[in-house]
Interface confidence: low
């Protein structure tokens, strides 16, 4: 039975040209995390494998950094980065947990969650 829950940063906004950290946290389960996939709509951004470490998709490696933790840092944001992002936790024996984050990249100088790179 899947008892875990994923907490995410939810709906967040950031300034064009800036950076943002996407974070998910799996709780309420003792399942072992074997891999975390980060996806943007249909595109794979990055993988963090428990044995092999991080792999960043080559098409994103100039703008995507691993971490902090199992999170993902997006840099040099553009308006085209606006959209849904998914953290997909592959676990044993539970199976797969998915968290959703919606990122809005703003043209203006003020973003709702303006404190970037903060570690909760």
């Amino acid at each position: 039975m899947m008892t875990g829950t994923i907490e995410t940063t939810g709906n967040i906004s950031a300034e064009k040209g800036g950076s943002i950290i996407l974070q998910c946290h799996l709780s309420s389960t003792t399942a072992q995390v074997t891999q975390v996939n980060w996806e943007q709509q249909d595109q794979l951004l990055a993988i963090c494998n428990a044995d092999l470490g991080w792999h960043i998709s080559p098409s994103f490696k100039d703008r995507v950094a691993p971490g902090p933790g199992l999170g993902l840092t997006l840099q040099s944001l553009t308006v085209n980065d606006t959209g849904e992002y998914f953290c997909i936790y592959h676990t044993y024996p539970d199976g797969t947990y998915t968290g959703r984050i919606f990122l809005e990249v703003l043209e203006s100088s003020v973003a709702e969650h303006g404190a970037r790179f903060q570690i909760p």
Epitope: C48, G53, W54, I56, K61, P66, G67, P68, G69, L70, I119
Partner: nanobody, 114 residues
């Protein structure tokens, strides 16, 4: 015991350079990515740079072109070369193991002032 020990901080004039070191022990250094973070007085801890075991590096916009992160797996040590330092770089600098951010060192103070 998993441990990280930072060193190399100090007082430097604006425009100067420092090289920070982070000695790691108790885990397989080459299997993780390492990150440098900093915390200025009265501010939240912020990410500065990351290095992946394959040599990939990433930087916060505020330090890009001035700071260089590297790692020597044979010495289990990560480095942060800081050039063209500015007063706003003043902070306590920490390194962290990147897989789970569960291990932090005690930090090393960098003060940029004339």
């Amino acid at each position: 015991e998993v441990q990280l020990v930072e060193s190399g901080g100090g007082l430097v004039q604006p425009g100067g350079s420092l090289r920070l070191s982070c000695a790691a022990s108790g885990f397989v250094f080459s299997s993780d990515w390492m990150g440098w973070f900093r915390q200025a007085p009265g501010k939240e801890r912020e990410w500065v740079a990351s290095v992946l075991r394959g040599g990939y590096t990433w930087y916060a916009d505020s330090v890009k072109g001035r700071f260089t992160i590297s790692a020597d797996n044979s010495k289990n040590t990560a480095y942060l070369q800081m050039n063209s330092l500015k007063p706003e770089d003043t902070a306590v600098y920490y390194c962290a193991r990147g897989d789970s951010m569960d291990v932090w060192g005690q930090g090393t103070l960098v003060t940029v002032s004339s």
